[in-house]
């Protein structure tokens, strides 16, 4: 069998095969040793018994999307049946005091590979043997502690494969310089040691994406905005836009990045090299926000200009592109190509509560039967739209441990002046957070208040 017969996936074009688009990967035209690495189709009954105590699940993730030319990293994590884990020696053991369907196990090992490898023969003293090889026959690399690595991972995409010996978790990075743009499929087959052969235990695949557009994400934050994810914001308060460029392999680390903003409110274009920007909308309505990110990234070098024409006519050699030497690249050339990323959003701007202030606090006269309680009136003003609810959160002086939260609807006139009465049980210092809210906004103010001891002899008391 060949690799492509075993790993059901895409194949490379002739161009890609010649250019070996994944550095360090091999063509799936290579032979696969099916005696050592048996191949089971989906639905084959043997999968049921490929692992003691249940099925192993492989989880494949990547840091996709990847800007073409950058590295993309794939991670595979094995999830073992309940009560099983990998120990420091790479053996699979039962967790202590863990009960599964079979109850507690007397044997601490699910798979004791250390014992197997000590028993193994046919080695030539270097740890090399006919079975310490990958599916294509290449020998295992002898890193320190390689004997504790008991899983073989075969990654396959775009007609190429990569083999890796590992523990229950592995990572593989791939350069995407010559990878086709668009969604692609990565498939991974995982084998475990089984005596002098290997047994498939899991297969997993995942879509990854290579793009020539910079992956851009924008977060938007505005003080007093009730819901930051609904793209509805408040008039007359700055919105902070923060641009995150998804570049996990730091491909653009040495690039100058320019951000070109159009806020859709006839304020023109704003160009910056800073990933954050503040903008205030002064009118209500719906606005189209557009961001273009530009970065000079490492990229392919253009072909050199054709040589100057000789003065005497010479026989034609065909198109310039037919000469393979003319298209060759100097590997160390550092050419730059402008890459662009785009973000677009429709933003709705509405009236909101812009500000809230406590302008007065008054101790309320209390009758004798409630000597431990103090009633305090907070006189509050606000700016912007009219609030429909008020909440007070009373907490300790550090404002961290909440003691009491009360919310109630309010009916406020256009002057936006209201009195909020709250009870304080006992003397001491309190932190009071007071918020005024409506459908779209939530404005907060805080104050520390000191409630003095009540004099039980005094029927009434007025505090500052």
């Amino acid at each position: 069998k060949r690799f492509h017969d075993v790993l059901g996936n895409e194949r490379p074009s002739a161009y890609m095969r010649e250019h070996n688009q994944l550095n360090g990967w091999s063509s799936d035209e290579n032979d696969w040793n099916e005696k050592l690495y048996p191949v089971w189709k989906r639905g084959d009954m043997r999968w049921k018994n490929s692992w003691k105590g249940g099925r192993v699940q492989a989880v494949l993730t990547s840091d996709s999307p990847a800007l073409v030319g950058s590295n993309i990293t794939f991670a595979v994590n094995l999830i073992f049946p309940r009560c099983q884990k990998e120990d420091a020696n790479g053996n699979i053991v039962y967790e202590k005091n863990c009960r599964n369907e079979a109850g507690l196990s007397a044997d601490p090992y699910v798979y004791n590979w250390t014992a197997w490898s000590e028993d193994s023969d046919g080695e030539n003293g270097t740890g090399q043997s006919h079975h310490n090889v990958f599916p294509d026959g290449k020998p295992f690399p002898h890193h320190p502690g390689w004997r504790r690595w008991n899983f073989i991972y075969v990654f396959h995409t775009l007609g190429q494969y990569f083999q890796k010996l590992g523990r229950c978790s592995v990572r593989v990075s791939v350069n995407t310089a010559n990878v086709t743009l668009g969604p692609q499929l990565m498939e991974v087959t995982v084998y475990r040691r089984h005596g002098r052969a290997y047994v498939p235990i899991a297969q997993v695949k995942d879509v990854y994406v290579v793009t020539d557009q910079i992956p851009v994400f924008v977060t938007m934050f505005q003080k007093n905005d009730r819901n930051s994810s609904d793209e509805t914001f408040l008039k007359d308060l700055p919105i902070m836009f923060d641009v995150l460029i998804h570049d996990p392999s730091h491909f653009l680390n040495y690039s100058t990045i320019n951000y070109k903003w159009s806020f859709g409110d006839n304020t023109g274009l704003f160009v910056s090299t800073n990933h954050t920007v503040n903008h205030t909308y002064v009118l209500n309505g719906t606005f189209s926000l557009n961001l273009t990110v530009k970065a000079a990234a490492p990229g392919p070098c253009p072909p050199p200009p054709p040589p100057p024409r000789p003065s005497k006519p010479t026989p034609s050699l065909g198109p310039a592109g037919d000469n393979p030497l003319e298209l060759s690249r100097i590997p160390d050339e550092n050419c730059q190509i402008n890459r662009y990323g785009h973000f677009q959003a429709t933003i709705t701007i509405v009236e909101g509560i812009l500000e809230v202030n406590i302008i007065q606090m008054t101790d309320v006269l209390m009758p004798v039967p409630w000597p431990e309680s103090s009633l305090i009136d907070f006189v509050v003003t606000c700016q912007g739209s009219i609030p429909t609810e008020v909440c007070t959160i009373i907490s300790d002086p550090t404002c961290e441990i909440t003691q009491n939260t009360v919310c109630s609807p309010v009916d406020v006139d256009e002057m936006c002046l209201l009195t909020v009465r709250r009870t304080f049980n006992g003397s001491g210092t309190y932190c009071v957070n007071l918020t005024l809210g409506d459908d779209t906004s939530l404005a907060l103010t805080s104050t520390l208040i000191s409630v003095p001891d009540r004099d039980p002899a005094s029927p009434l008391r007025m505090a500052n």
């Epitope: 059901g8 996936n9 895409e10 194949r11 775009l158 668009g182 969604p183 692609q184 499929l185 879509v207």
Partner: antibody, heavy 115, light 107 residues
Framework: QVQLVQSGAEVKKPGASVKVSCKAS????????MNWVRQAPGQGLEWIGA????????EYNQKFKDRAIMTADKSTSTVYMELSSLRSEDTAVYYC????????WGQGTTVTVSS | DIQMTQSPSSLSASVGDRVTITCKAS??????VAWFQQKPGKAPKALIY???YRYSGVPDRFSGSGSGTDFTLTISSLQPEDFATYFC?????????FGGGTKLEIK
Amino acid sequence: QVQLVQSGAEVKKPGASVKVSCKASGYTFTTYWMNWVRQAPGQGLEWIGAINPSNDYTEYNQKFKDRAIMTADKSTSTVYMELSSLRSEDTAVYYCGRSYSPDYWGQGTTVTVSS
Amino acid sequence: DIQMTQSPSSLSASVGDRVTITCKASQNVDNHVAWFQQKPGKAPKALIYSASYRYSGVPDRFSGSGSGTDFTLTISSLQPEDFATYFCQQYKSYPFTFGGGTKLEIK
């Protein structure tokens, strides 16, 4: 440039079978999956399945699992989709589309099922 | 199967208008969504992959956004050649499924 050229229109009777072909050129045939999608008159798109010409690995929409067979011929860079037990509701334009999510499409083959 | 619900099913607009088409998946499809344009009697043409990335040659007035279950195709300023039917597709899991389509007509 990439081209997918499909076979000509077909008229079939209910219960019969039809085999539609899609010949690929402009790229190496075994590189990409080939999807089959159909579109009934005035309707939307419906995914039938996909085949990997490299090893004839297939994925089918369960709705067509028992009636559709996709095959690939590497020697001619052609994929085929055969649909059996035809009924009137199979009247549609059948498209092939290259890649995991199609980036290039064939021109379409009209299949009419009528008694 | 994952259902892709596209809205509106039809839309009248004028040249220069900004148009938004939405697609809602019945379950999470991450960003594994593509958008296609189809003109009468023609095969679909791929516009967008992975929810927001344009295929080469697609004008930048076309933009896609969304993740999870809610996706949007926006045409920022309609051109005469943009009047067509638009489809979304999820390729997160088999069977791949398409939205019902949005027919964009001249007002």
